[in-house]
């Protein structure tokens, strides 16, 4: 008696955050007995696409030649073997950047900060937005959301960090978005290099995992502290 078919593995290359107009490939990996692969997109008629497996039959490729708003969203895949359909994969969230103009990222009082002190990263958009995201390059947990409550629109969001340690050092970018689609982001801000000096109490190097990968045991999330300014903005980890 066969047990339940294991859920397939679903991922995107070159990653799950794709600029408008760029190509992306979605891969679904199952077993050698897979006869068909199906990709479903949330809030779209199922199946969104079907593919025959590639040799040696344990995976299938779903190609998006040019990323647009229509492709952004949440996907799951399945495979069919002689004993039936598998469980669904874990979801893949495909995010498109370039939907809105880029925000500006700055550090207050300065991007040069002494360990143990405080710094605030400020993300400002030209037009009012209700979600701001701070991304640290090569961090295990790269996305920090500040989302407005009650649909209130804001021109900026503050990301306070206190006390700062060496883990906070690195390159940051921010994005802005509208709440009606968390899968559509602005162009990225220009990068901001946060330099932490005099870090004695935290000699561990900064984590080096790239965006949208699973975190290893040594990885530490970026964990800003302090109250969130702009009443109406809440901090969300996703």
């Amino acid at each position: 008696q066969a047990g339940p078919l294991p859920k397939p593995t679903l991922w995107a290359e070159p990653g799950s955050v794709i600029s408008w107009g760029n190509s992306v490939t979605i891969w679904c990996q199952g077993t050698l007995e897979a006869r068909e692969y199906r990709l479903d997109k949330e809030e779209s008629p199922a199946p969104w696409d079907r593919q025959n497996p590639l040799e040696p039959k344990n995976k299938a490729r779903f190609s998006i030649p040019s990323m647009t708003e229509d492709y952004a969203g949440r996907y799951r895949c399945y495979y069919r073997s002689p004993v039936g359909w598998s469980q669904p994969s874990d979801p893949l969230e495909l995010v498109m950047t370039g939907a809105y103009s880029k925000p500006t990222l700055s550090a207050l009082p300065s991007p040069l900060v002494t360990s143990g002190k405080s710094v605030t990263l400020l993300c400002q958009s030209r037009s009012p937005m209700d979600t701001f995201l701070l991304i640290k390059e090569r961090a295990a947990h790269p996305l920090l959301h500040l989302r407005s409550e009650h649909g209130a629109q804001q021109h900026q969001a503050e990301f306070p960090m206190s006390p700062v340690t060496s883990v906070h050092g690195g390159t940051y970018r921010c994005f802005s978005s509208h709440g009606f689609s968390h899968y559509l982001l602005s162009h990225p801000s220009d990068p901001l290099e946060l330099i932490v000096s005099g870090s004695l109490e935290d000699p561990r190097p900064s984590p080096t995992r790239s965006v949208s990968t699973a975190a290893g045991p040594e990885d530490q999330p970026l964990m800003p502290t302090g109250s969130v300014p702009h009443s109406g903005l809440r901090r969300h980890w996703e």
């Epitope: 066969a2 047990g3 078919l5 991922w11 891969w27 990996q29 007995e33 040696p56 344990n58 490729r61």
Partner: antibody, heavy 116, light 107 residues
């Protein structure tokens, strides 16, 4: 916790036969493809065989085709490798591994020595 | 059969160094390339699958890249426990084949 435990290795004369077993636990064995990989003393890894989840499909490299047979008993959560017409160059540690895209879990290995 | 060639065959490095190991395939693999680490007397351990996909529980200093015929495994900052032998393996077509291995030694 996924566990794979090989057994059945030992000393055998050239031309002889041996049957290796791999006892699996901690996962739905009948739903996964499985492989055997070997490593000669001081050498690199060599893929030996793969069997699909139900046992319907088997795969071998030319170096063992016709001499080795992979099989499985899903009711017993067991994987097997029947090795016939053994040669000195088959001397190696034999590992069983679960195949999920890559070989994601491995046993500790069992040593097969072919010598007169 | 697809031939897998790793370079270098051996490498001496120090703790804290950034190390890159290359694997070349005799024909295109798309992304069907996996990396393993093996320590003496132990079974191999999967590090990276499908060229660049990381694995929960594997330290973040290990990363993979490449597609087609050329792939790399990078260790961003070597730790004492990383001294081992590293193998690439293709699963694009039968027979599956491994690279000959790269032995990473302490300088």
């Amino acid at each position: 916790e996924v566990q794979l435990v090989e057994s059945g290795g030992g000393l055998v004369k050239p031309g002889g036969s041996l049957r290796l077993s791999c006892a699996a636990s901690g996962f739905a064995f009948s739903s996964y493809d499985m492989s055997w990989v070997r490593q000669a003393p001081g050498k690199g890894l060599e893929w030996v065989s793969t069997i699909s989840s139900s046992g319907s499909y088997t795969y071998y490299p030319d170096s063992v085709k016709g001499r080795f047979t992979i099989s499985r008993d899903n009711a017993k959560n067991s994987l097997y490798l029947q090795m016939n017409s053994l040669r000195a160059e088959d001397t190696a540690v034999y590992y069983c591994a679960r195949l999920w895209g890559a070989m994601d879990y491995w046993g500790q290995g069992t040593l097969v020595t072919v010598s007169s | 059969d697809i031939q897998m060639t790793q370079s270098p065959s051996s490498l001496s490095a120090s703790v804290g160094d950034r190390v890159t190991i290359t694997c070349r395939a005799s024909q295109g693999l798309t992304n069907d390339l996996h990396w393993y680490q093996q320590k003496p007397g132990k079974a191999p351990k999967r590090l990276i699958y499908y060229a660049s996909q990381s694995i929960s529980g594997v330290p973040s200093r290990f990363s993979g890249s490449g597609s087609g015929t050329e792939f790399t495994l990078t260790i961003s900052s070597l730790q004492p426990e990383d001294f081992a032998t590293y193998y690439c393996q293709q699963s694009n077509s039968w027979p599956f084949t491994f690279g000959q291995g790269t032995k990473l030694e302490i300088k």
